[in-house]
């Protein structure tokens, strides 16, 4: 019985989300293995949450909003193993925005999900950032690693995009 | 006072190349993006190239990409714009033009007097 | 390309009274509070001039009659009271994504 109403539970929030998402891919997670998380299909899965490379060239603003049609946000990295999960799914010859930005040129870092700007967990490329023009951060590879970069804004490039896992 | 102007136009052939340029002064010219921004005669402003302050970005629209290179001297306080197999299309009055950034993008706070690139046979 | 159109493609206008000019963008131009709108003047044989920056901020110099407004897609330039001066092309340009874009202009004339 219990194990009955758990499911019909799951069936009613799939087909929740099944609106906004036509397709998730889930795996079972927890002590006992009873519950369940997914990530859009085909979207890819890392700790709580998941990410989608966008390779579609679009300004920083527009990226940002095509994220959150998705309900969810240009990426906010937090770790150093977040970031080396993330690259390696981007194509070492292309750019993709992050959701930080310094929208006033004063160097007031911010990212997209409000996170608090930590220079302590920062990934920028040697000698970056360097101008306050280039208020938008992308992720690209340089020197033989992976790094940020101040762009400008407007300049359309390809994007991450980063949600919560949902829960079911 | 901030002071551009552009020189360099003239008559040229289809196929034909020239090289605009803009004096600046006024300003300190290394710490702004420049733009260069055309009209043709009875039509609406088109933006043609632009350069960042560091010289590290150039941007063009697809109708120049391959045949227009924007560049700028620094030291020199000023801008070029090389223009290579013109066509009857590129005639218009050239401007320069200076950026400034506004939050996630930029306006054209100051404009040169223009000058005029005539593409004919 | 973001399209801007603009209306009316021409106006005459008495002296005193207000010009109202409208640029629908194609797609919005603003973000989280800030629009990425400008305004431009243009006298005959001069080059474009710089009016309203960021949908409504009076570039210095210029005289207050001239006022900007708007978001997302619906922008205007307002002129009030017009002065015989101010007989020109206006145009409104777009800077939220590359390529920057132009409208088609409209005309003021004083009657």
């Known amino acids: 019985n219990f194990m009955y109403s758990k499911t019909v539970k799951r069936l009613s929030k799939l087909q929740e989300y099944q609106q906004y998402y036509p397709s998730l891919t889930c795996v079972m997670e927890g002590k006992d293995m009873e519950d369940w998380s997914c990530c859009p299909t085909p979207w890819t899965s890392f700790q709580s949450s998941c990410y989608f490379i966008s390779t579609v060239m679009q300004s920083w603003t527009k990226s940002q909003n095509n994220c959150s049609v998705m309900g969810a946000d240009l990426v906010v990295i937090n770790t150093k193993e977040e970031q080396d999960f993330i690259t390696q799914n981007l194509k070492i010859n292309s750019a993709y925005f992050l959701g930080l930005s310094d929208p006033k040129g004063w160097r007031h870092w911010q990212w997209v999900d409000q996170t608090p700007y930590n220079k302590n967990v920062t990934f920028w490329h040697s000698g970056e950032p360097n101008s306050p023009d280039e208020r938008c951060a992308i992720i690209n590879f340089r020197s033989e690693e992976w790094g940020w970069n101040d762009v400008h804004c407007h300049v359309p490039q390809k994007s991450i995009c980063k949600m919560k896992k949902i829960y079911i | 006072e901030v002071q551009l102007v552009e020189s360099g136009g003239g008559l040229v052939k289809p196929g034909g190349s020239l090289r605009l340029s803009c004096a600046a002064s006024?300003?300190?010219?290394?710490?702004?993006?420049m733009s260069w921004v055309r009209q043709a005669p009875g039509k609406r402003l088109e933006w043609v190239a632009t350069i960042s302050s560091g010289d590290s970005y150039t941007y063009y629209p697809d109708s120049v990409k391959g045949r227009f290179t924007i560049s700028r001297d620094n030291a020199k306080n000023s801008l070029y714009l090389q223009m290579n197999s013109l066509r009857a299309e590129d005639t218009a009055v050239y401007y320069c033009a200076r950026q400034l950034y506004y939050s996630y993008g930029y306006y054209f706070d100051y404009w040169g007097q223009g000058t005029t690139v005539t593409v004919s046979s | 390309d973001i399209v801007l159109t603009q209306s009316p493609a021409s106006l005459a206008v008495s002296p005193g009274q207000r010009a109202t000019i409208t640029c629908r963008a194609s797609e919005s131009v603003s973000f989280h509070g800030t629009h990425l709108m400008h305004w431009y003047q243009q006298k005959p044989g001069q080059p474009p001039k710089l009016l309203i920056y960021?949908?409504?901020n009076l570039e210095s110099g210029v005289p207050a009659r001239f006022s900007g407004s708007g978001s997302g897609t619906d922008f205007t330039l307002t002129i009030n009271p017009v002065e015989a001066e101010d007989t020109a092309n206006y145009y409104c340009?777009?800077?939220?994504?590359?390529?920057?874009?132009f409208g088609g202009g409209t005309k003021v004339e004083i009657k």
């Open positions: 960021a949908a409504s």
């Open positions: 006024g300003f300190t010219f290394s710490s702004y993006g």
């Open positions: 340009q777009q800077s939220i994504e590359d390529p920057p874009t």
